[in-house]
């Protein structure tokens, strides 16, 4: 699905949100210092705009010296391993002036029995072993240290945790005579956190556990455990939060039922049910307690586990997620889409929207895509005129301002952003789609027709003529 779409910058970018962190002065590991604002009280907005402008213009002077790379550190505790017994690890780029830490969990599906794990090892070894990992990685999207690319948290300490446990970050079993593979996803996160405490995490104010796809589900499964781990280790003041991207799946009925043969065709409930047993998977305590023995698979589904979590979690999910469609056996091949499938797809968006109803911090554009936060152009997509970095900034503010107890949203700073239009790519800021055969970019109208959406059918509920709708879509409105 990677080749089908590209991300492009928009000509007209909204101004970046206010910086949530100022760059520290050289050699000064502080994030704030007292200022006397009495002289500017009457015009604080203007003053702050000037400060921001100054900070942004000075930034390139320091940025030239910056190395964008995150550096690999294999775990010192070599008993915490990838599937094949090689040590797990993490990539780190420190930002000594910052007390913010971003830990990102990589995604990449899963395997749930000996046969499909063997196949995964043959074809995707990087996701099961650390033996061939590069020494460095470049931070992109939310992991970028460039304010232009990452207006949200550019100055944070960045940690990328590669996915090599194939267990949706839930496993707690080591390799043995009996077990051909280790599944230690949950233990890898705990060990990375433990080792990072010795590298500066101990002084953190906020730890944001983020992840995409299987990593996004991993956030939901592990965020409370990380909070508890830090509490037990004597760091109760570190605020632990979660950012789950493209990991909020539905255990809905497949479009066409297929037997559980491989990772892709197996219904998610069945795959996870088998996986938990194979991985010795652990789920959040409070969620597990709600279900009977053998029913813990329920806790892999966002809408079931989310209400049991204590840490604040921001959910990012495309309403028409490609991985969700894949496990539902929906394969958009370029052939015209039959009405039954079109209704199925629209219903999926509706169901997903419904599950986010009580998630105060969420960003769900009506696009057909998968993953967003470590894409370089993650700033492009907007819901109701607000970009994701801006929404995350508002979320930070809401958590800070309300001391986490109040439910009142900040004026002009929304955090619950869920598209309400009903079909894929009805949001004009969606990532551009390419025809998977010709590679040509398609506009929304072309894409919808290509998918077999009859313009009359699409326009009618909006109270529009097909020609009016086409005009609006072409103009990106």
């Amino acid at each position: 699905s990677e080749g089908r779409k590209t991300w492009r910058r928009r000509g007209q970018q909204p101004p970046p949100p206010p910086r949530t962190e100022a760059a520290p002065a050289a050699g000064q590991p502080v994030e704030s210092f007292p200022l006397d604002f009495t002289a500017v009280e009457g015009n604080m907005d203007s003053f702050m705009a000037q400060v921001k402008s100054l900070a942004q213009s000075l930034y390139p002077c320091s940025a030239q010296q910056l190395n964008e790379d995150l550096r690999l550190h294999l775990l010192l505790n070599t008993s915490v391993t990838c599937n094949d017994g090689s040590p797990a690890g993490y990539y780190l780029k420190e930002s000594r002036g910052s007390r913010r830490w971003l830990l990102f969990l990589e995604g990449g599906w899963y395997c749930f029995n000996r046969e499909n794990c063997d196949s995964r090892y043959d074809t995707m070894r990087r996701l099961m072993s650390s033996r061939d990992w590069p020494r460095t990685r470049t931070g992109t999207g939310i992991l970028s240290s460039q304010p232009e690319e990452n207006p949200y948290w550019w100055n944070a300490n960045m940690v990328f945790i590669p996915y090599c446990s194939s267990d949706v970050w839930s496993g707690a079993s080591s390799k043995s005579e009996k077990n051909e593979y280790a599944f230690m996803g949950a233990l890898i996160i705990q060990e990375v956190v433990r080792e990072l405490l010795g590298r500066g995490l101990s002084g953190a104010k906020v730890l944001l556990l983020a992840g995409s796809s299987a990593g996004g589900t991993g956030v939901l499964l592990n965020v409370d455990r990380v909070a508890e781990q830090l509490e037990k280790l004597g760091y109760p003041a570190i605020q632990v939060r979660g950012l789950a991207d493209s990991g909020w799946f539905l255990d809905n009925k497949q479009y066409r039922h297929t037997d559980c043969v491989d990772t892709i065709t197996c219904a998610p409930t069945e795959a996870i049910r088998r996986g938990i047993r194979y991985w010795n998977g652990v789920v959040p305590e409070r969620c597990r307690r709600q279900f009977q023995e053998g029913e813990e698979w329920n806790c892999f589904f966002g809408y079931k586990v989310y209400p049991t979590l204590r840490c604040p979690v921001f959910v990012v999910q495309w309403l028409f997620d490609e991985a969700q469609l894949t496990v539902d056996n929906v394969h958009l091949t370029g052939q015209p889409v039959q009405e039954g499938l079109r209704l199925y797809i629209q219903n999926l968006g509706r169901e997903l929207r419904h599950t986010l109803k009580d998630v105060p911090a969420s960003f769900a554009p009506a696009c057909l895509s998968h993953e967003i936060i470590i894409r370089s152009h993650w700033t492009d997509v907007q819901v109701k005129g607000t970009s994701l970095p801006r929404a995350l900034h508002c979320w930070d503010r809401s958590l800070h301002d309300s001391h986490k107890a109040s439910k009142t949203p900040l004026k002009g700073c929304p955090v619950h952003l869920v598209d309400s239009c009903p079909w894929p790519h009805c949001n004009p800021s969606c990532p551009t789609v390419r025809d998977q055969f010709t590679g040509q970019e398609m506009n929304v109208a072309q894409f919808l027709m290509h998918m077999g959406f009859d313009m009359q059918t699409v326009a009618q509920p909006q109270g529009l003529e097909p020609s009016e709708l086409l005009g609006m879509l072409s103009n990106g409105s």
Epitope: A172, R310, K404
Partner: antibody, heavy 120, light 113 residues
Framework: QVQLLQPGSVLVRPGASVKLSCKAS????????MHWVKRRPGQGLEWIGE????????TYNEKFKGKATLTVDTSSSTAYVDLSSLTSEDSAVYSC?????????????WGQGTLVTVSA | DIMMSQSPSSLAVSVGEKVTLSCKSS????????????VAWYQQKPGQSPKVLIY???TRESGVPDRFTGSGSGTDFTLTISSVKAEDLAVYHC?????????FGGGTKLEIK
């Protein structure tokens, strides 16, 4: 040190409601679930439910749904249980309790309990 | 709901004696993923609130005398007092925190002869 303070006793009429309080001190109130337990002589202990003060989320024992409502006031670090439509069966000692850690609920800290007597 | 049954409901012992209190659950309280038994034991002295003695079936709470020992796994659990003292006069409760709703046993009343 952790303290959970509860009033000693309250007398209520059948059919009435009562709101019992539990004032917490010595720890960050919003970071731990607060539990309520009912104690009747000769009948052992019954778990009523729990509330997470940070976001107001609750889990109830089905048996007490409709009878007990858990709330908190974070500004005063106080948890409450509201008991409605009281009958003699509700006469008991009601205690608040807190776990040692966030997620594992054996009860390391207990309030002294409030004796509720339902009598005409 | 998981039922917790304690036996005996009461017993009288002499100071210095060894006592064994039993608690049985209607389903296993051992979680295979972490190999822990989700059982706690409490002591409730007359006119006082319960006080935790043991959690994870066998971990002694700090400050609890070592004459108190918890054991067992799955569905059968035991609290042993190796040499009873007069101050051990109390009701002893077991509790499961494995599944909602949390449930307690009916209690065992320990009296001193």
């Amino acid at each position: 040190q952790v303290q959970l303070l509860q009033p000693g006793s309250v007398l209520v009429r059948p059919g009435a409601s009562v709101k019992l309080s539990c004032k917490a001190s010595g720890y960050t109130f919003t970071s731990y679930w607060m539990h309520w337990v009912k104690r009747r002589p000769g009948q052992g202990l019954e778990w009523i439910g729990e509330i997470y003060p940070n976001n107001g989320r609750t889990t109830y024992n089905e048996k007490f749904k409709g009878k007990a409502t858990l709330t908190v006031d974070t500004s005063s670090s106080t948890a409450y249980v509201d008991l409605s439509s009281l009958t003699s069966e509700d006469s008991a000692v009601y205690s608040c309790a807190r776990g040692l850690y966030y997620d594992y609920d054996w009860f390391a800290y207990w309030g002294q309990g409030t004796l509720v007597t339902v009598s005409a | 709901d998981i039922m917790m049954s304690q036996s005996p409901s009461s017993l009288a012992v002499s100071v210095g004696e060894k006592v064994t209190l039993s608690c049985k659950s209607s389903q296993s309280l051992l979680y295979s993923s972490n190999q822990k038994n989700y059982v706690a034991w409490y002591q409730q002295k007359p006119g006082q609130s319960p006080k935790v003695l043991i959690y994870w079936a066998s971990t002694r709470e700090s400050g609890v005398p070592d004459r108190f020992t918890g054991s067992g796994s799955g569905t059968d659990f035991t609290l042993t007092i190796s040499s009873v003292k007069a101050e051990d006069l109390a009701v002893y409760h077991c509790q499961q925190y494995y599944r909602y709703p949390y449930t307690f046993g009916g209690g065992t009343k320990l009296e001193i002869k």
